[in-house]
């Protein structure tokens, strides 16, 4: 029995097999910063993690999901001030006793070196240099993301 996320993933993969991709042809919305195939919006105000999650949702986006260390570094390179912390879309799941991304996947322990405890009511923030576990009630800034949608052209035989 596949989860809805897994089903969606399979559908996307099948779609990709039938199409060619031309990524980067669609631009980020105004005021969003392009970072590779994502658009990022860094908040100006502070909020607890739940409110940050909700704000991104109202912007038809999500809290930042970081695929790997390379993406973390590139995101951190956009942050000018060492002292500013930003929520991302990762929090501690008490039931599964693990760090869980808001898309339902679990953190690969090699991806992020987290400073602080993995415990109830802990959420993850990033700074220019580090990744921190913070109380989810802490009011800090946050980063929303939108995925850039590749423009796909159908591949036709002999075209």
């Amino acid at each position: 029995q596949k989860s809805s996320i897994e089903k969606c993933s399979v559908d996307i993969q099948q779609s990709r097999n039938k199409t060619t991709e031309r990524p980067g042809l669609l631009n980020c919305p105004i005021y969003w910063q392009q970072l590779r195939e994502k658009c990022l919006l860094f908040s100006h105000t502070v909020n607890p993690w739940n409110n940050s999650l909700a704000d991104c949702s109202t912007k038809e986006s999500s809290l930042l999901l970081i695929r790997d260390k390379d993406e973390l570094i590139h995101t951190q390179n956009l942050i000018r001030d060492k002292a500013i912390l930003f929520w991302i879309g990762l929090n501690f799941s008490l039931s599964e006793k693990n760090w869980k991304w808001i898309n339902g996947s679990f953190l690969n322990s090699n991806d992020l070196e987290i400073r602080g405890d993995a415990k109830e009511n802990s959420c993850i923030s990033i700074s220019q240099t580090s990744v921190y576990s913070e109380y989810c009630s802490t009011e800090i800034r946050w980063i929303c993301q939108k995925e850039l949608t590749p423009v796909r052209n159908k591949v036709y035989p002999d075209s």
């Epitope: 105004i30 005021y31 910063q33 860094f42 100006h44 000018r80």
Partner: antibody, heavy 118, light 107 residues
Amino acid sequence: QVQLQESGPGLVKPSETLSLTCTVSAVSINSYYWSWIRQPPGKGLEWIGYIYYIGTTNYNPSLKSRVTILLDTSKNQFSLKLSSVTAADTAVYYCARDLGIEGGFDYWGQGTLVTVSS
Amino acid sequence: EIVMTQSPASLSVSPGERATLSCRASQSVSSSLAWYQQKVGQAPRLLISGASTRATGIPARFSGSGSGTEFTLTISSLQSEDFAVYYCQQYNNWPLTFGGGTKVEIK
């Protein structure tokens, strides 16, 4: 009371670089977007560009090759450099805070007239 | 770039009367439109953002409407301090662009 104050020379020679600084008080520049806007005498407003508090910039394509905007968080200032100026760059230059997707420039400096003349 | 066209270029109105100012965008800017008031020798002042939301401290006699390409700023009952130049500005696309302004004069 949030205040923005432009400073810099009021007279610049043709082909030289116009340099202005905006000092922000009562609010940190570690938020929002910080823009430069100009207004030639008796004419309308033209957006020059902004610097985002994380350090990225965006410039008006009509001026992009000549513009640099920098941020100095330690002094709570941002600055404008416009190279290779001509008489057409004579204008009142304003610095302003841009609210981004929330919309509009909500705080402005009082403006400084820069004349390009030999 | 998106060209913002304001009309009329000037408007003569008596104090207490209603003034209606128009702004047209060369392509849709959704609701990403702001209005400013500028008096002689002063910086512009933000009146309206999001096409219809009054900025902090702006009197209720100022109202904005419209979306897409057609926008209106209405001053319901002109006061002496309202005689000024009014600019619209779009923030839906780069570069940010302003209209040419409408001068509201005393009749």
